[in-house]
């Protein structure tokens, strides 16, 4: 069950973790001691589900979190918007070389919407994600964390859907929101010709040819 959130008209949302009511129930590996689902409140006092991990004291961390299957709905390129907090290692006493300040984002294309396990070698790395500003002493409030936003895109996609995965290697992270969307060119009318909603191409600069039709009471 999802609640509605308002996004730009040219973006079609495939996944919005903040709109899910109840637990997200994504798959974590290991099952315990890694990523943990945590409920917090948004500014409207509505519960939102987040995932957090903070094993900064222990070396050799390899904690994975995988979303449910995401249908691509014909989109060849999708965008991933992540809102997260990330702890500055300098603010954590005694963590030395074990603390990291990045995490990794992966995807895996699949026609199977019910894969139960995380097979790390199937996933393709999208990018290493770092905070634009970690939250230690943001302004003067050391109990208030800056919410970072990073957007990445991936494509061309060809299978029915895909899974996203987040790999922690020893950082202190909270994933507050994950949104996956594709872009479309909205319905347009030019010179009495109507062009339908059209999903953008595989590349950001791709031109997609689309056939128009005459508006009512006009002829070709």
């Amino acid at each position: 069950v999802t609640g509605s959130r308002v996004y730009p008209a040219n973006e079609v949302t495939l996944l919005d973790s903040r709109s899910v009511q109840g637990e997200l129930g994504w798959i974590a590996s290991p099952l315990e001691g890694g990523w943990e689902e945590v409920s917090i409140m948004d500014e409207k006092n509505t519960p939102i589900r987040t995932y957090q991990v903070c094993n900064v004291m222990e070396p050799s961390q390899n904690n994975w979190l995988r979303t449910d299957w995401i249908t691509r709905e014909g989109a060849q390129r999708v965008y991933i918007e992540i809102k997260f907090t990330l702890r500055d290692c300098n603010s954590l006493p005694g963590v030395m070389g074990t603390c990291k300040e990045t995490f990794n984002l992966y995807y895996y294309e699949s026609d199977n919407d019910k894969e139960r396990f995380i097979r790390e070698n199937q996933f393709v790395k999208i990018d290493t994600i770092a905070a634009d500003e970690s939250f230690t002493q943001v302004d003067i409030g050391d109990r208030i964390m800056k919410l970072n936003t990073e957007i990445r895109d991936v494509g061309p996609l060809s299978k029915k859907g895909f899974y996203l995965a987040f790999q922690d290697v020893g950082a202190c992270i909270a994933l507050v929101s994950v949104r996956v969307f594709y872009k479309k060119c909205p319905l347009t009318v030019r010179n009495l010709a109507q062009f339908p909603d059209t999903i953008t191409g595989a590349d950001t600069s791709s031109l997609v040819e689309v056939r128009g039709s005459c508006v009512n009471n006009s002829e070709e």
Epitope: E36, D42, C54, T85, P93, V138, G141, R143, I144
Partner: antibody, heavy 126, light 112 residues
Framework: EVQLVQSGAEVKKPGSSVKVSCKAS????????ISWVRQAPGQGLEWMGG????????NYAQKFQGRVTMTRDTSISTAYMELSRLRSDDTAVYYC???????????????????WGQGTMVTVSS | DVVMTQSPLSLPVTPGEPASISCRSS???????????LDWYLQKPGQSPQLLIY???NRASGVPDRFSGSGSGTDFTLKISRVEAEDVGVYYC?????????FGGGTKVEIK
Amino acid sequence: EVQLVQSGAEVKKPGSSVKVSCKASGGTFSSYAISWVRQAPGQGLEWMGGIIPIFGTANYAQKFQGRVTMTRDTSISTAYMELSRLRSDDTAVYYCARELLYCSSTSCGTHGFDIWGQGTMVTVSS
Amino acid sequence: DVVMTQSPLSLPVTPGEPASISCRSSQSLLHSNGYNYLDWYLQKPGQSPQLLIYLGSNRASGVPDRFSGSGSGTDFTLKISRVEAEDVGVYYCMQALQTPLAFGGGTKVEIK
């Protein structure tokens, strides 16, 4: 309705340690911060420190640094506060208190101590 | 560290009449996100404290609407529009912007 239930009163000798527990019933324990606040007889409230999950490690008031350890065991929904090298002026009621976590569009923080334990009286006397 | 100063120390009140408590911080509690990190608590005799107001002006769940919080930066006020007998106790303000969190010294509200 979430409740925080603390361990019973303690009488301790100077130089010893005390460990107070705070068990949550109801709600998701991992979803909120736990702070510890103490109140000496006839005095005001004093914040000792706390653990905010998405901040990572415990955060202690400088006054108690090196003497206090705060931990939590999410599997049994219990938080602990251990104070060592006790002195007579540590005689006080020790409270655990819950803080809800929230995120706005630009930042994350906490929403005040909305639920308190009943308090644990710790008496330090020779 | 932020220092919190409350006044008055003691406040004798008449039921049905309004009451006001002032709290001043040594540093601004207004964050760039627009929130004032100031909470108000009431500790009734023999009880644990209870949250009345968070983030300067937001009433906590179950708190009667006769309680209101106002102010910004360094100066804050808790108002009780019509005092009731059950409102007696010690009122504390607390800054929650940065560690160490700090409480005011308290204001004891008692019936005249």
